[in-house]
C-alpha cells in the first residue's frame, strides 16, 4: 500500500531500519551515534546554504522475537516485517536507510512499491546490482569482480608479465557477510569472473586448500580467499607452500595493514592482500570511539548515508523541486558528494566507487607495502612499487599455470 511520507513543509524525516540481523555485528547504539553525527553535519550544511528546514531520523527497531540469529541468515523476513510496521504506523520518511543484508534488501526491493530511495551499508551480492532506487555505500561484489578480472588480464607491469586465466576459490561457508557474497559472485557460473576465466574450481574443505599448496598436479597457482590474516593462518598454519603459489586475500574493510607498527607474519609472504585505501582517522569522532578498525567502515557508511541524503535534499530544495517524487528516488547515483571522510563517488547504479589497494609483504622489511592501486570508477590500475621485494622468483609474480611459458 502507498504509505504517506513525512517529507514536506520544511520537515524531512529519515527512516533508519535498525535490524537485529546485520552484515556486521555492530551494536545498534553505535549505528545510532553515527546517524546522529551525520544529522548534525547535515543540519549545519543546510543552514549554511540558507535552507531553514528540519531534518530528523526515526529509528525503527524490530521486536527481535522471531529474527534473532544476529547474522543475515534470517534477515529476509525481518526487513519486510519492519516495512509492514512502518506502513501500519503510517510513518515513512523521505528515504530508507537500512538493510545491510543482501537477502533482506533483495526481498524488500522485490516486494515493495519503492517510490523512495533506499540506502544500504552492505547488500554486497550480485542480486542487488542495478537496482534503480538502491544506493550501496560499501563496495559490492561486482566491484571486486571487475578488479580481479582486470588484474588477471594485466601483463604489462614490471612485476606481472603474464596474463592469468585460472584460479582456485576457497569458500567453506563460514565467511562473514561481505566475504560470503564476494566469494558467491566469484563462484557463480554466470558471473563476469567465471566468464572471463578458463579454469576455476571452488575449494570447500580445509584439506582441499591445504593439499593444493604443494600439489604438483594443481591446475592453477592462484588461490582467492576472503578474510583476515588470522583466518588464513588457521587454515594454512606453517605448512610449506610451493614457490609459485599466489594467495589473494580479500580483506577490504580492514585498515590494520596501514598502521605504522604492523609487521607481516611469515605466513603472509606468498600472499597479496586486497583492501581499501585507508580513510582519514575517525578516532576523534564521537561515534567511532568504541569501534574496532574493521567496524569503522560499516558505521561510516551509515553516517555517509545521512550525508548523501542531506546532499540530495539540498540540491532539490535549492531547485525548488518536490522530494516525494520518483525523480528524487532515482537521483541517488552518478554523483560525488562530500562524505565524512572526503568526497564519495557513486556510479551510474548508485554503488560507491573506491580505491582498492593490493599489498604485498616485503621480504626485506617484513612490512606490508603497496603494490598497486585500482580505481573502481574508471576500472584502471596504477602501479605503485615497480621493483617490489617479493618472495617470488625474480621479484615477479609467477604464471598462473606452472610450466607455461610467457603469454
Amino acid at each position: 500500500s502507498q504509505v504517506s511520507q513525512n517529507c514536506h513543509n520544511g520537515s524531512y524525516e529519515i527512516s533508519v531500519l535498525m535490524m537485529g540481523n546485520s552484515a556486521f555485528a555492530e551494536p545498534l547504539k553505535n549505528l545510532e551515534d553515527a546517524v546522529n553525527e551525520g544529522l548534525e553535519i547535515v543540519r549545519g550544511r543546510l543552514q549554511n546554504a540558507g535552507l531553514n528546514v528540519t531534518v530528523n531520523a526515526t529509528f525503527m527497531y524490530s521486536d527481535g522475537l522471531i529474527h534473532n540469529s544476529g547474522d543475515c541468515r534470517s534477515s529476509t523476513c525481518e526487513g519486510l516485517d519492519l516495512l509492514r510496521k512502518i506502513s501500519n504506523a503510517q510513518r515513512m520518511g523521505c528515504v530508507l536507510i537500512g538493510p545491510s543484508c543482501t537477502y533482506s534488501t533483495f526481498q524488500m526491493y522485490l516486494d515493495t512499491e519503492l517510490s523512495y530511495p533506499m540506502i544500504s551499508a552492505g547488500s554486497f551480492g550480485l542480486s542487488c546490482d542495478y537496482k534503480e532506487t538502491l544506493t550501496r555505500l560499501m563496495s559490492p561484489a561486482r566491484k571486486l569482480m571487475y578488479f580481479l578480472v582486470n588484474f588477471w588480464k594485466t601483463n604489462d607491469l614490471p612485476f606481472k608479465t603474464y596474463s592469468w586465466s585460472t584460479s582456485y576459490v576457497y569458500k567453506n561457508g563460514t565467511e562473514t557477510e561481505d566475504c560470503f557474497w564476494y566469494l558467491n559472485a566469484l563462484e557463480a557460473s554466470v558471473s563476469y569472473f567465471s566468464h572471463e576465466l578458463g579454469f576455476k574450481v571452488v575449494l570447500r574443505q580445509d584439506k582441499e586448500f591445504q593439499d593444493i599448496l604443494m600439489d604438483h598436479n594443481r591446475k592453477s597457482n592462484v588461490i582467492i580467499m576472503c578474510g583476515g590474516p588470522e583466518f588464513l593462518y588457521k587454515l594454512k598454519g606453517d605448512r610449506a607452500v610451493a614457490e609459485d603459489i599466489v594467495i589473494i586475500l580479500v580483506d577490504l574493510f580492514n585498515d590494520q595493514y596501514f598502521e605504522d607498527n604492523v609487521t607481516a607474519p611469515d605466513y603472509m609472504k606468498n600472499v597479496l592482500v586486497l583492501t581499501l585505501s585507508p580513510g582519514n582517522s575517525l578516532l576523534n569522532s564521537s561515534f567511532s570511539r568504541n569501534l574496532s578498525p574493521t567496524k569503522r567502515d560499516f558505521a561510516l557508511a551509515y553516517l555517509n548515508g545521512i550525508l548523501l541524503f542531506g546532499h540530495m535534499l539540498k540540491i532539490f530544495l535549492e531547485n525548488g523541486e518536490n522530494i516525494t517524487t520518483p525523480k528524487f528516488a532515482h537521483a541517488f547515483r552518478n554523483l560525488t558528494f562530500e562524505g565524512y571522510d572526503g568526497p564519495v563517488t557513486l556510479d551510474d547504479w548508485g554503488d560507491v566507487d573506491s580505491t582498492m589497494v593490493l599489498l604485498y609483504t616485503s621480504v626485506d622489511t617484513k612490512k606490508y607495502k603497496v603494490l598497486l592501486t585500482y580505481d573502481t570508477h574508471v576500472n584502471k590500475t596504477y602501479p605503485v612499487d615497480m621493483s617490489p621485494t617479493f618472495t617470488w622468483k625474480n621479484s615477479k609474480l609467477p604464471n598462473d599455470i606452472t610450466g607455461r611459458g610467457p603469454q
Epitope: D156, P158, S277, P278, T336, G342, P343, T345, T355, V357, V370, T373, Y374, D375, H377, V378, K380, Y382, P383, V384, M386, S387
Partner: antibody
Amino acid sequence: EVQLVQPGAEVKKPGSSVKVSCKASGGTLSSYAISWVRQAPGQGLEWMGRIIPILGITNYAQKFQGRVTITADKSTSTAYMELSSLRSEDTAVYFCARDQRPASMDVWGQGTLVTVSS
Amino acid sequence: QSELTQPASVSGSPGQSITISCTGTSSDVGGYIYVSWYQQHPGKVPKLMIHDVSHRPSGVSNRFSGSRSGNTASLTISGLQAEDEADYFCSSYTSSNNYYFGTGTKVTVL
C-alpha cells in the same frame, strides 16, 4: 571531467619558501598520482616529485630531495608542493599534473609562476 | 643522468613525416613501458600525445605514433601540419622510482 586549478603567481624572496596548491575540480584526486613539474623561462620540463594522495606515498627527484615537500588533503581534493630555501634559479612556472599511468600526465594545471627576487 | 637526450630541433615541410628520438638507458626508456610524449605550444600547458610507448589518448590525431627500439623511443608525426609546430618532450619512468624528461625538441614546419 577533472580539472586541476592552480593560483596564478607568487613572488618570493631568496631564502624563503613557497607553497603552491593544486585543487581538483569536477572530480577527486582519486587513486592516481599527482606530479609536480617545473619549467624555467625558455627551458625544458623538469620533474620534481609526485604523491599518491589516497595513500600519502611520495617520491622526489634527487635534485630536490630535502628541499621539496609534496602533500595532499583528500578531504578537499587539493595537493600542495612546498619548495624551501628559494634562490633566483627557482624562478619558473610550476605545474601540477595527474599521472593516469606512471610518467604519463594527462591532465595539467594552468601553472603557477613563482618569481624569486630580492 | 637525469635527462633523456633529444635532438634540439627537427623540421619538415607540410605533408612530410618527421621522427623525433629520445635516448635513455636500460634503467629508464629501455626498461619500462612507461614512456610518454608531450606537445607544448609557446605559453601553453603541455599536452599528452603518447603514453606507454605507443598508446594514443583519445582526441589525439592518429598522425602521431610512438615506438621504441632498445633504449631509444621515437615519436613520428606523419602528414605534418602547421599546427604541429611546437616543442616536444619525452618522459620515462626510471628504476629509481623517478621520472625523467627529455631535453626537448623544437619542431618547425617549413
